[in-house]
């Protein structure tokens, strides 16, 4: 069984709160004396809230022509690629475009791949000056293509006490750091056999939220120097070692939203909704996330507050039983008031059956 | 022992219309797709439909579109319901399981480890 | 749509000879290709799939290759149980192609 994605890395200017608000407060990002005035101000030396970002997109096939448009359940994932899906016995195929002016890779967490797919490069016997070229499955050129495959072998799904489906997550690895700082990354979620309906989703699931909260830290992004240029106005007077310009520059997000920007955070109350939490970053991303409201249940407790590392993901069931507007957001201190908040809604809705007939 | 078996073909006058049922067993196909393809006599095979067991998620080839409808009744029971038949619509239609499959953009196709003996479909006056 | 030649539409072997059978896609459907054997009366069967790979059953003197648009069956020690039609089928799973079939090659085994 094969899951075949085709997923470009491209160019996009991303804005990190599009209503110019912050949700929670209702004032202008740029407030004087706001929590937000100082990632959103833009000035002489300072970016503000939009970048220039690498994201990974899903395209319709190998022409990277058509791209696939998000719908309503999608427009969550915001900065993060597409949701990559398999159960255990799947092989997986993604056919990668890199469209980017950077050599780009992808290297996932959690699926089993030979060298020839690794989308990390090293030299088995390191050698500095050794001039060897880096194979291609780690070092896609710009303009270029190659096509990834990743095996599900039972040894890397669910266990019976897992849940039945599992958060991991994907991203660029040629300089890792700088890579997933510039965007690239993305959800996957790897699930037991038998446990999905046709087009990915979980049974008896009714939604499936992926959050990637983090510290998006611009300055370690491969393409600062673009920022600066594109959004100061003073480019030449930028010191980028200077204290206050780097930690403006530092993003508490999630899915690359801040302060409750993020959209589609919907559901009805009585849902079946899993939340998959996945992390990554440095050691500022140490993260307790919140959900006021309602609690979920994550190996038999009942929680309200989740426990988040770099590289570490979890999956999370919640049944909300309370209608109303709510947080999600990062309790560490600086990540709540740097805007690592967002605001789900549980709807009373009428229920309706879904058609799921296609023609070819 | 895996095994399908087709029944309810048989002579239809033309623009009439027919059920036919495939019948598996020796396996549970709720994580199978279960598929009907044709074969006219003298020519190649042709896909019609498939169905997901686990879900009754459904696709169709374009030329299939409102005639043809497949409907997993049981578990271990799929239909195909035809109408508004023509004689060009005569073959003998098989059922096939897809146990070997690719997702790509939203839609799956199928290789067929599995097919049933055919039952033969004629449309004549 | 994906349409799918195969030549030629008819071949002689001779018993420990070998075959080649040639399917050619009008567009790239990667290794998403199936190869079926057919004797008159029986319905298909799978010989291969993923271009190259066999179902367990299938005897190792059928062999798959290619991929792209190019793809070949090969069958070595050619036995007279071999003598069928032979069909390839592309199932490259796409929302604008019909999973489509070659119109087959007949081996006659002497």
């Known amino acids: 069984h094969v899951r075949h994605y085709y997923i470009a890395a491209e160019e996009i200017i991303w804005n990190y709160a599009p209503s110019g608000i912050d949700i929670f407060t209702k004032e202008n990002l740029t407030a004087p004396g706001s929590d937000s005035a100082v990632f959103f101000e833009q000035g002489t030396t300072r970016i503000g809230g939009s970048y220039k970002k690498l994201v990974y997109r899903e395209y319709t096939d190998a022409s990277f022509t058509n791209r696939k448009e998000r719908g309503p359940e999608e427009e969550h994932l915001g900065i993060l690629g597409p949701v990559i899906w398999a159960e255990v016995g799947d092989t997986i195929r993604v056919t990668f475009h890199n469209k980017g002016a950077y050599p780009l890779s992808i290297e996932p967490i959690g699926v089993r791949f030979n060298k020839n797919n690794e989308g990390t490069y090293y030299s088995p016997n390191y050698n500095p000056q050794s001039r060897s070229v880096p194979p291609s499955a780690s070092h896609v050129a710009p303009t270029e293509t190659f096509t990834y495959e990743w095996t599900v072998p039972k040894e890397v799904g669910p266990t019976n006490a897992d849940p039945v489906c599992l958060a991991k997550m994907y991203y660029s690895a040629v300089e890792p750091t700088k890579d997933i700082f510039t965007g690239l990354i993305g959800p996957m979620k790897i699930c037991k056999k038998g446990s999905l309906h046709a087009n990915g989703r979980q049974k008896d699931v009714d939604k499936e939220f992926y959050l990637f909260p983090t510290v998006f830290d611009e300055n370690e992004s491969l393409l600062l120097e673009d920022n600066i240029r594109m959004f100061t106005t003073a480019p030449d007077q930028v010191d980028k070692e200077d204290e206050d310009f780097q930690e403006s520059n530092k993003m508490h997000s999630m899915n690359g939203f801040m302060y409750g920007n993020q959209p589609g955070l919907t559901m009805c109350k009585g849902d079946s909704v899993v939340w998959y939490l996945f992390s990554a970053g440095n050691e500022a991303d140490v993260h307790g996330i919140y959900f006021s409201g309602n609690t979920y249940l994550w190996r038999g407790e009942r929680r309200d507050t989740a426990n988040l590392f770099p590289q570490t993901s979890l999956t999370l069931h919640m049944w909300p039983d309370t209608e109303g507007t709510f947080n999600v957001e990062c309790l560490t201190t600086d990540h709540y008031t740097g805007g690592m908040k967002q605001k789900y809604t549980v709807n009373q809705c009428r229920r309706q059956s879904e058609d799921s007939t296609f023609y070819l | 022992q895996e095994q399908l078996v087709e029944s309810g073909g048989g002579l239809v006058q033309p623009e009439g219309s027919l059920t036919l049922t495939c019948k598996a067993s020796?396996?549970?196909?709720?994580?199978?797709?279960m598929c009907w393809v044709r074969q006219a006599p003298g020519k190649r095979p042709e896909w019609i439909a498939c169905?997901?067991?686990?879900?009754?998620?459904s696709y169709f080839a374009g030329w299939a579109k409102g005639r043809f409808t497949i409907s997993k009744t049981s578990s271990t029971t799929v239909t195909l319901q035809m109408t508004s038949l023509t004689a060009a619509d005569t073959a003998t239609y098989f059922c096939?399981?897809?146990?070997?499959?690719?997702?790509?953009?939203?839609?799956?196709?199928?290789?067929?480890?599995?097919w049933g003996p055919g039952t033969l479909v004629t449309v004549s006056s | 749509d994906i349409v799918m030649t195969q030549t030629p539409a008819s071949v002689e072997a001779a018993v420990g000879g070998s075959v080649t059978i040639k399917c050619q896609a009008s567009?790239?459907?990667?290794?998403?290709l199936a190869w079926y054997q057919q004797k008159p009366g029986q319905p298909p069967k799978l010989l291969i799939f993923?271009?190259?790979s066999l179902p367990s059953g299938v005897p190792s003197r059928f062999k798959g290759s290619g991929s792209g648009t190019q793809f070949t069956l090969t069958i070595s020690g050619v036995q007279c149980a071999d003598a069928a039609t032979y069909y390839c089928?592309?199932?490259?799973?796409?929302?604008?192609?019909?999973?489509?079939f070659g119109g087959g090659t007949e081996v006659v085994v002497k």
């Open positions: 567009d790239d459907i990667y290794s998403y």
């Open positions: 993923d271009a190259s």
């Open positions: 169905i997901y067991g686990g879900d009754g998620t």
């Open positions: 020796g396996f549970d196909f709720s994580s199978y797709w």
């Open positions: 096939a399981r897809a146990d070997y499959y690719v997702y790509v953009d939203g839609g799956y196709g199928h290789a067929y480890d599995l």
């Open positions: 089928q592309n199932y490259y799973g796409s929302s604008s192609s019909v999973h489509a």
